[in-house]
Amino acid sequence: DVERTTCPPEKEVHEIDESLIFYKKRELEACVDAALLAAQMDRVDAIPFTYEQLDVLKHKLDELYPQGYPESVIRHLGHLFLKMSPEDIRKWNVTSLETLKALLKVSKGHEMSAQVATLIDRVVVGRGQLDKDTADTLTAFCPGCLCSLSPERLSSVPPSIIGAVRPQDLDTCGPRQLDVLYPKARLAFQNMSGSEYFVKIRPFLGGAPTEDLKALSQQNVSMDLATFMKLRREAVLPLSVAEVQKLLGPHVEGLKVEEQHSPVRDWILKQRQDDLDTLGLGLQGGIPNGYLILDLSVREALS
């Protein structure tokens, strides 16, 4: 429980202003009324409070809003946002992109990835889906933040906004997120010509299934090795040596550099050594000639 002290009459706070920077922690606790603070939140960020003083102000707001802050307060948090935990943010309901922008700006340069991820999640929930305006805000103010959303949230992304997503926005996306985004991208770019389509779909290919990779191998796309290394292991394993060669084109030589790394290493283990030898790259670890490959998973599925 909080240790209660009485506010000295001469320290009574009638408005939130610069005089408060001279208040000790105990004086702020005793003299600043949370309801007054909330009503004058727009003044707080202009006052150079110490981190200790900001802690007190946060606790005051927590006292007033045990179920989470209303957006009228969140909008004006400013540097107080740096004091928020993901658990605090999870209680919020945020719909305004102005609020999102303001807090993304504050978080820049601070280690707040968990808080930002939770904030974006609350915005998506508050707005009902990740609409184009939200996506545009994220790409402008927080490149890479799109990938902080859970696959469940990303599932609400309409294909129409995929075109606004830049390759760098997907750099930190994991396989589960790309699994969700890839079908949307495929739908969004389906009417584009081969080369244009590949440029657009490339950042999303970490979510592509084997059959789509096989189809791409027939289109002379010359996939760079960085993209290949981000493909799903399960999608790459069934590809033949010839298909990988066609998929990578002149970049096939890069397989030698990556032969110890997944998915290249796992793919090599699945190929016949004599097929690998046709590449002339000296890749080792394939199935020796004369060995019979039994796919037990197929037999299990049949029984």
Epitope: A30, C31, D33, H59
Partner: antibody, heavy 119, light 108 residues
């Protein structure tokens, strides 16, 4: 169901003291701002005081500052108003009310207790 | 302190008529912090409108609030017999949290 029940009102002489109580139930008292509002006979409402739930930060109307003290006992879900140096103009029905920080206003009120200051 | 002035002092109207009550503040009040209450004789006040325009739980939609800055309005679109009462505005923008002096809506 939210309930606020005031008690402690009565007749008191000028200069005397009285302590009002307000028993709260049906909501999380320990998380809620509470207020006292009064109404003199035939007159309008006058905000008297409020108190925060955790830090017990207090605020008062100028007319009662230095004479009245608001307090709370969170373990008993009870709000108090200690009234000292009472004057004839303090005669009123005193209401205890719950402050809703989300729907900003006094959303639940007690039935009131009458304080009469007279010689 | 913020002084709230309500007008008119008394409004004499018939059931079914529209009532328009005014609340003027001596200095600007954030609309989030303006509330309206209804009080009937012998009863405690009841919160009608918060945030200048949002109806409190259980309040019929014939009650509506509007305004910003220093001028706020409570409107009752069609007066029902149970609406004849005294109405108060209150600001929570700064301390003390003052009330207006009230507007009595009486049957004509």
């Amino acid at each position: 169901e939210v309930q606020l029940l005031e008690s402690g009102g009565g007749l008191v002489q000028p200069g005397g003291s009285l302590r009002l109580s307000c028993a709260a139930s049906g909501f999380t008292f320990t998380q809620t701002y509470m207020s006292w509002v009064r109404q003199a006979p035939g007159k309008g409402l006058e905000w008297v005081s409020n108190i925060s739930p955790t830090y017990s930060t207090t605020n008062y109307a100028d007319s009662v500052k230095g004479r009245f003290t608001i307090s709370r006992d969170n373990s008993k879900n009870t709000l108090y108003l200690q009234m000292n140096s009472l004057r004839a103009e303090d005669t009123a029905v005193y209401y205890c009310a719950r402050y809703n920080a989300y729907q900003i206003g006094l959303d639940y009120w007690g039935q009131g207790t009458l304080v009469t200051v007279s010689s | 302190e913020i002084v709230l002035t309500q007008s008119p002092g008394t409004l004499s109207l018939s059931p079914g008529e529209r009532a328009t009550l005014s609340c003027r503040a001596s200095q600007s009040v954030s609309s989030s912090y303006l509330a309206w209450y209804q009080q009937k004789p012998g009863q405690a006040p009841r919160l009608l409108i918060y945030g200048a325009s949002s109806r409190a739980t259980g309040i019929p939609d014939r009650f509506s609030g509007s305004g910003s800055g220093t001028d706020f309005t409570l409107t009752i679109s069609r007066l029902e017999p149970e609406d004849f009462a005294v109405y108060y505005c209150q600001q929570h923008n700064q301390y003390p949290n003052t009330f207006g002096q009230g507007t009595k809506v009486e049957i004509k």
